[in-house]
């Protein structure tokens, strides 16, 4: 978990002020209006490990 203004969240996640932690961009499929989803639009997803 990252505080705002410090190192960015890991790939596939974005900072949520509501949750006070890095949140999963994957959850924007079910909850597109979450405060962190705008930050996910610019961030690449975490890669699949096949």
């Amino acid at each position: 978990e990252q505080a705002p203004g410090t190192a960015p969240c890991s790939r596939g996640s974005s900072w949520s002020a509501d949750l006070d932690k890095c949140a999963d961009c994957a959850s924007c499929r079910a909850r597109p209006h979450s405060d962190f989803c705008l930050g996910c639009a610019a961030a690449p997803p975490a890669p699949f490990r096949l």
Epitope: L19, R29, A30, S34, A46, F48
Partner: antibody, heavy 119, light 111 residues
Framework: EVKLQQSGGGLVQPGGSMKLSCVAS????????MNWVRQSPEQGLEWIAE??????????HYAESVKGRFTISRDDSKNSVYLQMNNLRPEDTGIYYC??????????WGQGTTLTVSS | DTVLTQSPASLVVSLGQRATISCRAS??????????IHWYQQKPGQPPKFLIK???NRDSGVPARFSGSGSGTDFTLNIHPVEEDDTAIYYC?????????FGAGTKLELQ
Amino acid sequence: EVKLQQSGGGLVQPGGSMKLSCVASGFTFSYYWMNWVRQSPEQGLEWIAEIRLQSNDYPTHYAESVKGRFTISRDDSKNSVYLQMNNLRPEDTGIYYCACRYADYFDHWGQGTTLTVSS
Amino acid sequence: DTVLTQSPASLVVSLGQRATISCRASQSVSTSDYSYIHWYQQKPGQPPKFLIKYASNRDSGVPARFSGSGSGTDFTLNIHPVEEDDTAIYYCQHSWEIPPTFGAGTKLELQ
């Protein structure tokens, strides 16, 4: 530390009623979808009910097996979620867990409470 | 409903070896970016413990010995090297739609 503390459960006769409660702490309760999941040797882990957020007028979802008999509710001012179970059947016997999820995975679970439906 | 089929039902592995658990979905549970499969570990008398989200991302505090992979309909949980503390039942779960369903579980035992 996230904690989900459950209460309720016990022995009830077929056709009877029971209410389960779950009090949450350690996270922003009002942002999370709250769920009840039950476990039995016959059915394994079975999701049975979910209640979402106040911002959407608390939409609820139920498994077909409990629809019309069980009612999930929440009180954000008390960080609590409830499961009212009516017209109970023997096949409702099992361990009941409350669990939270933001959207997809159940990251925290209560300790579980046992319900036995038997005459 | 999306049905998750786990195999094997039980697995006996020697200490330090690899345990491989499969979870197959009755329909695709992946987008181009993410797979909506999650893994849990349950020990006797305890609730399930969340391990891996979105097929391959470990929860904080979960040892690197646990890894997940897969997309579409076929997913795998690997544990290597297996330790004594890993004796448990492992479940997959999807969040593709309502209802979210679980696999029947795989019981991992040590030889």
